[in-house]
């Protein structure tokens, strides 16, 4: 039996509106019906939870209403979008996947996606 491998892109550049999207793909060792996906941010060896969602296979991901994340799932692939990012949020974003049900439980952790966020230059005042 193989460990659960989680793949995600190495680098993503956020848009000028502070939105970053990436795919988190996992190779499931079992036939899970309930999957939990968590996005973690690692900066200066500190790890914090950005957002998390549990979904039933075939259904949509449901993040909390106040979450900065949205996402869709297709098979063993999750498309994640993080919004409201600023330059200070630049860091390594790790995709963590847990197969919750049915047993046995499995955990898989990606190597992380380095998200670069550049704050847009403020627009100069125009005189008309």
């Amino acid at each position: 039996c193989k460990a659960m491998h989680v793949a995600q892109p190495a680098v993503v550049l956020a848009s000028s509106r502070g939105i970053a999207s990436f795919v988190c793909e996992y190779a499931s060792p079992g036939k899970a019906t309930e999957v939990r996906v968590t996005v973690l941010r690692q900066a200066d060896s500190q790890v914090t939870e950005v957002c998390a969602a549990t979904y039933m296979m075939g259904n949509e991901l449901t993040f909390l209403d106040d979450s900065i994340c949205t996402g869709t799932s297709s098979g063993n692939q999750v498309n994640l979008t993080i919004q409201g990012l600023r330059a200070m949020d630049t860091g390594l974003y790790i995709c963590k996947v847990e197969l919750m049900y049915p047993p046995p439980y499995y955990l898989g952790i990606g190597n992380g996606t380095q998200i670069y966020v550049i704050d847009p230059e403020p627009c100069p005042d125009s005189d008309f």
Partner: antibody
Framework: QVQLQQSGPELVKPGASVKLSCKAS????????INWVKQRPGQGLEWIGW????????EYNEKFKGKATFTVDTSSSTAYMELHSLTSEDSAVYFC???????????WGQGTTLTVSS | DIVMTQSHKFMSTSVGDRVSITCKAS??????VAWYQQKPGQSPKLLIY???TRHTGVPDRFTGSGSGTDFTLTISNVQSEDLADYFC????????FGAGTKLELK
Amino acid sequence: QVQLQQSGPELVKPGASVKLSCKASGYTFTSYDINWVKQRPGQGLEWIGWIHPRDGSTEYNEKFKGKATFTVDTSSSTAYMELHSLTSEDSAVYFCARRGLLGPLDYWGQGTTLTVSS
Amino acid sequence: DIVMTQSHKFMSTSVGDRVSITCKASQDVGTLVAWYQQKPGQSPKLLIYWASTRHTGVPDRFTGSGSGTDFTLTISNVQSEDLADYFCQQYSSYPTFGAGTKLELK
């Protein structure tokens, strides 16, 4: 700093039940699973299971199903493990440990010594 | 269950030596392995996670390596305070621990 403070030693009679506690401080209690681990004298470590304080969901080692029950009180940031129908085989040190976001048990309580004897 | 096998129950060393403690998983666990140090009468302390990442405050003489099924904890320049029990643990599935290796003086 992260701390897990466990209840004191227990001496109980065979057949009885006991409830051990683990009070967390220094972090957001509801964001991390609490695991329970058994260690018999001179022996290795045996995972009993975990509880997720946010929703109370649990996972148990098959061997401890029916033997251990986990609960939490989020208002006091305390996790509990109740052990049932005690026998001498349950005499051990029991540790609670926080499960880090990346999976390992990153902080441990000092342990509670349980002695089951008539 | 995934079985973690630490083939050496005891390992003898001297202060200043370099020692390697090994651990083998019964199936592929990727890099989801941690190492703990436990001294008599104390709780275990996390040293290494993700097979090779040092936990906060752990001296850099402790290094972890390996992936798949074979893992190693290496202590270079062993200090007297390093004499303890060392446990490996996988967390790819329900957590399981190795039986432990006691590091003692020659």
